[in-house]
């Protein structure tokens, strides 16, 4: 099939002991090979500080996955979710302030 770029959505969890969990979700993409990883100040985080979901079919002939990491509250602006898919790339910030959702469709 033809390439379908992912929708990327970054969300924050509730605060717990000064930490928050930031989750980057990629959905509705094809083919299934995708890079999704967190960066701090532009530098890739180590694998052992991130958690990944499996790349799963979403029932529409496309795929979905996610990656999450825990960060200190107030340092959200230092973190970005990086995506590579089928020769395209994108960088997605953690939403700041009261906005807990950010999504973008790549073309």
């Amino acid at each position: 099939g033809s390439t379908v770029p992912p929708m990327v959505n970054v969300t924050c969890s509730e605060v717990s002991e000064g930490n928050i969990t930031v989750t980057c979700r990629a959905s509705s993409f094809y083919p299934r090979n995708i890079t999704l990883t967190w960066r701090q100040d532009g530098v890739s985080l180590s694998h052992n500080t991130q958690q990944w979901g499996d790349v799963l079919p979403d029932g529409n002939g496309t795929y979905q996955t996610w990656v999450a990491t825990r960060i200190r509250q107030g340092e959200e602006q230092r973190f970005t979710c990086y995506m590579e898919h089928s020769g395209n790339h994108g960088t997605h910030p953690v939403p700041s302030g009261n906005s807990h959702h950010h999504h973008h469709h790549h073309h």
């Epitope: 052992n48 990086y82 020769g87």
Partner: antibody, heavy 120, light 107 residues
Framework: QVQLKESGPGLVAPSQSLSITCTVS????????VNWVRQPPGKGLEWLGM???????DYNSALKSRLSISKDNSRSQVFLKMNSLQTDDTARYYC??????????????WGAGTTVTVSS | DIQMTQTTSSLSASLGDRVTISCSAS??????LNWYQQKPHGTVKLLIY???SLPSGVPSRFSGSGSGTDYSLTISNLEPEDIASYYC?????????FGGGTKVEIK
């Protein structure tokens, strides 16, 4: 068919800088990372750093002050520059494509390597 | 940095033998381990990724296992073309680090 080919100067004088080019084919540099790895004679492999599809870089902190990795997507070339070379930088230098899918990150295709000797 | 140790630097085995190469990490690397084969002329090839996954084109006589800090590569039936050095590599934490290598020779 994915291929990578390194080209370098062969011989570099101590305290001088090293420039190596990795020319790739069969994939787009805009959407895949390329890594640099070296191997001194008779020794093991050492990761130097990488450049991602968007041009951002990660370096081995032990060498970060001397290293620079860049690329030209349109020419399908990745460049390694290392400053202040010493004799212990003598090694075979490899570029390798990085595949990073969730929990999996590996160097799936390697160039043949280029030998660099640091000597006066 | 995480230190990767391959205690056996070289070994001799007969064709058809089962060969096991060990690799240990200085800390838990959560299965974030790859194996590479380097032929005597220098060509490097990915052999195993994420502890036990085989890339396409790699013969099924190669297998990987392990967890925590201890990992191994097994060649179930040694063939002439397996004469090479084998390197483990962790990617749990940046920078990725390699073991010192194990050279496999024919008796």
């Amino acid at each position: 068919q994915v291929q990578l080919k390194e080209s370098g100067p062969g011989l570099v004088a101590p305290s001088q800088s090293l420039s190596i080019t990795c020319t790739v084919s069969g994939f787009s540099l805009n959407g895949q990372g390329v890594n640099w790895v070296r191997q001194p004679p008779g020794k093991g492999l050492e990761w130097l750093g990488m450049i991602w599809g968007d041009g951002s870089t990660d370096y081995n902190s032990a060498l970060k002050s001397r290293l620079s990795i860049s690329k030209d997507n349109s020419r399908s070339q990745v460049f390694l520059k290392m400053n202040s070379l010493q004799t212990d930088d003598t090694a075979r230098y490899y570029c390798a494509r990085g595949a990073h899918y969730g929990k999996r990150w590996y160097f799936d295709v390697w160039g043949a390597g280029t030998t660099v000797t640091v000597s006066s | 940095d995480i230190q990767m140790t391959q205690t056996t630097s070289s070994l001799s085995a007969s064709l058809g033998d089962r060969v096991t190469i060990s690799c240990s990490a200085s800390q838990n690397i959560n299965n974030y381990l790859n194996w590479y084969q380097q032929k005597p002329h220098g060509t490097v090839k990915l052999l195993i990724y994420y502890t036990s996954s085989l890339p396409s084109g790699v013969p099924s006589r190669f297998s990987g296992s392990g967890s925590g800090t201890d990992y191994s590569l097994t060649i179930s039936n040694l063939e002439p073309e397996d004469i090479a050095s084998y390197y483990c590599q962790q990617y749990s934490k940046l920078p990725p680090t390699f073991g010192g290598g194990t050279k496999v020779e024919i008796k």
